[in-house]
């Protein structure tokens, strides 16, 4: 069944305020790979909330078994619950599938938070609200897990959309998207529009909410405003990019740009927060604190541990600064910036004790594995994973949450020299370690 109609978001307009809608730029249109224009059958095929991940409905096996699968651009295994678990309503039953093939191999995947293990096989897979194809894909049947499945999240598996280099147990295990492209005529590109709720969801609203869209094989122009700006994929493992400058309310953090990418910067839909390297996080928090100093918040808030609440509808968005990340552009010495609002980096959460209040968690946190541009960043933008051309595109999302004064933005070009120097070169070890955050 279709996932339901798109609802206007309570604390923001569906697009920029009237009069501010940017004209569609066409200079990049002719260069887009794949089908252009409308992917009606794929729009609104995601559900979920930033705190628990976004999932797409998939079917596995013959006859088809329907499962909800977390969309994760920060890992590369397609894995599904395959045994009873207290948090799972349903799971993949291999013995019921006539097309299941055992690969006779175990697999173990640790994330920053949570881990799982299981048995590898292949089966027929399709996406009901996706392209009209069925592919044979590698599947990890999860038999044991720890802090991986989330109570009430409504997903039963994970779709790792990154590259084979970080697949487990090794890079010989072909990821789902590679199989999809190889076995069909679908172009090697997908795009994500993650629509943050903008307000805490109670049970009734949660059922009606729509999470966003995963467009497989191209770009849907109805999902963004303005133009798409592209940053190169530095290396095909995670979706690694290079940040060349960071500003808080237009104030440069003035750090050596290598610090922003230490030890990497990735775009990861499976992580909730914007995660920053220790030094960068400390500088950013100092700057955000200073900008929002008209109100005092406990230290626990800045550590992501404590909620802050305001009477419903009175959240003082204007006291919080915007955060801008400048990304390496496609042209030498050219960058562009993406700007998010507090509506993205303050994550709405339900506080049972004060359900009449609007409560939020600070969704910027510290990382020891580099910058992770998680859902709080992605919820501001339509993000194009143009694998065919080794680049990631950003445009202002048509569903991002904002107010009448400010909107998320993607702007450029800016002149930035020596951007290559901003990338950190990880010392070569025998094996790279998958440490995707699930913060």
């Amino acid at each position: 069944t279709h996932l339901g109609i798109r609802l206007p978001l309570r604390s923001g307009l569906a697009g920029p305020p009237l009069g501010l809608r940017l004209p569609r730029e066409t200079d990049e249109e002719s260069e887009e790979p794949g089908r252009r224009g409308s992917f009606v059958e794929m729009v609104d095929n995601l559900r979920g909330k930033s705190g628990q991940g976004y999932y797409v409905e998939m079917t596995v096996g013959s006859p088809p078994q329907t499962l909800n699968i977390l969309v994760d651009t920060g890992s590369s295994n397609f894995a599904v619950g395959a045994a009873p678990h207290p948090f799972l309503h349903r799971y993949y039953q291999r013995q019921l599938s006539s097309t299941y093939r055992d690969l006779r191999k175990g697999v173990y995947v640790p994330y920053t938070q949570g881990k799982w293990e299981g048995e590898l096989g292949t089966d027929l897979v399709s996406i009901p609200h996706g392209p009209n194809v069925t592919v044979r894909a590698n599947i990890a049947a999860i038999t044991e897990s720890d802090k991986f499945f989330i109570n009430g999240s409504n997903w039963e598996g994970i779709l790792g959309l990154a590259y084979a280099e970080i697949a487990r147990p090794d890079d010989s295990l072909e990821p789902f998207f590679d199989s999809l492209v190889k076995q069909t005529h679908i172009p090697n590109i997908f795009s994500l529009q993650l629509c943050g709720a903008g307000f805490p969801l109670n049970q009734t609203e949660a059922l009606a909410s729509v999470g966003g869209s995963m467009i497989i094989g191209g770009i849907d122009h109805s999902l963004y405003t303005g133009r798409l700006w592209y940053t190169p994929i530095r290396r095909e493992w995670y979706y690694e990019v290079i940040i060349v400058r960071v500003e808080i309310n237009g104030q440069d953090l003035k750090m050596d740009c290598k610090e922003y990418n230490y030890d990497k910067s990735i775009v990861d839909s499976g992580t909730t927060n914007l995660r920053l390297p220790k030094k960068v996080f400390e500088a950013a928090v100092k700057s955000i604190k200073a900008a929002s100093s008209t109100e005092k918040f406990p230290d626990g808030f800045w550590l992501g541990e404590q909620l802050v609440c305001w009477q419903a509808g009175t959240t003082p968005w204007n006291i919080f600064p915007v955060i801008s990340l400048y990304l390496m552009g496609e042209v030498t010495n050219q960058s562009f910036r993406i700007t998010i609002l507090p509506q993205q980096y303050l994550r709405p959460v339900e506080d049972v004790a004060t359900s009449q209040d609007d409560c939020y968690k600070f969704a910027v946190s510290q990382s020891s594995t580099g910058t992770v541009m998680g859902a709080v960043i992605m919820e501001g933008f339509y993000v194009v994973f143009d694998r065919a051309r080794k680049r990631i595109g950003f445009a202002v999302s048509a569903c991002h949450v904002h107010d009448e004064f400010r909107t998320a933005a993607v702007e450029g070009p800016f002149v930035t020299a020596d951007m290559e120097d901003c990338g950190y070169n990880i010392p070569q070890t025998d094996e790279s370690t998958l440490m995707t955050g699930r913060a």
Epitope: K105, G106, Y108, K115, E117, T143, E144, P169
Partner: antibody, heavy 124, light 107 residues
Framework: EVQLLESGGGLVQPGGSLRLSCAAS????????MGWVRQAPGKGLEWVSA????????YYADSVKGRFTISRDNSKNTLYLQMNSLRAEDTAVYYC?????????????????WGQGTLVTVSS | EIVLTQSPATLSLSPGERATLSCRAS??????LAWYQQKPGQAPRLLIY???NRATGIPARFSGSGSGTDFTLTISSLEPEDFAVYYC?????????FGGGTKVEIK
């Protein structure tokens, strides 16, 4: 000190059944994978079965699949191997072994130490 | 099934000599390979795991190397207590398999 004590071995006729037990102490049993390995007299080693800490992941050798069942009782710190439809080629010393973590398939999670073993003889 | 072939079957050496034991897999096992030592009447004990990591309490004279299909266990200078049978084992694919063993005996 880690201790693994196997019991339940003995002489059984072909087609018969036997249940081996492995009593574990000196570590948190529920947080370790456990396994059974066998060694026929004068021969090499053969993996028989293994289970993750909570029993979710289970491995069986092809030669015993459908005949042997591994299980564990974490409240009793005991690992079991139920052996049915026994054959002459199942004759061996059966060792119980402790995994390096709760995970069965994790790199680094190898099995050590092993118990001293219990002899199973299948003969008419 | 992945077959692990150990060579030589028997290695006759004197204490103080260097022992080099080989384990070859019929297909890649990445680094999911370990080495065990077994003395007569005793249970095996883990020496090396994940191809090159020494297990807890194992002396530095034991070292492992290799990945993919070719693996080596080296004992840099044999001690009297090192004379035993050595097995390699893989956990990359089902079924998990052991090599046939290499017996290191006193010359």
């Amino acid at each position: 000190e880690v201790q693994l004590l196997e019991s339940g071995g003995g002489l059984v006729q072909p087609g018969g059944s036997l249940r081996l037990s492995c009593a574990a102490s000196g570590f948190t049993f529920s947080s370790r994978a456990m396994g059974w390995v066998r060694q026929a007299p004068g021969k090499g080693l053969e993996w028989v079965s293994a289970t993750s800490g909570s029993g979710g992941s289970i491995y069986y050798a092809d030669s015993v699949k459908g005949r042997f069942t591994i299980s564990r009782d974490n409240s009793k710190n005991t690992l079991y191997l139920q052996m049915n439809s026994l054959r002459a080629e199942d004759t061996a010393v059966y060792y119980c072994a402790k995994g390096g973590s709760q995970w069965l398939y994790a790199p680094g999670s190898w099995f050590d130490p092993w118990g001293q073993g219990t002899l199973v003889t299948v003969s008419s | 099934e992945i077959v692990l072939t150990q060579s030589p079957a028997t290695l006759s050496l004197s204490p103080g000599e260097r022992a080099t034991l080989s384990c070859r897999a019929s297909q890649s096992v990445s680094s999911y390979l370990a080495w065990y030592q077994q003395k007569p009447g005793q249970a095996p004990r883990l020496l090396i795991y994940d191809a090159s990591n020494r297990a807890t309490g194992i002396p530095a004279r034991f070292s492992g190397s290799g990945s993919g299909t070719d693996f080596t266990l080296t004992i840099s200078s044999l001690e009297p207590e090192d004379f035993a049978v050595y097995y390699c084992v893989q956990r990359s694919n089902f079924p998990w398999t052991f090599g046939g063993g290499t017996k290191v005996e006193i010359k």
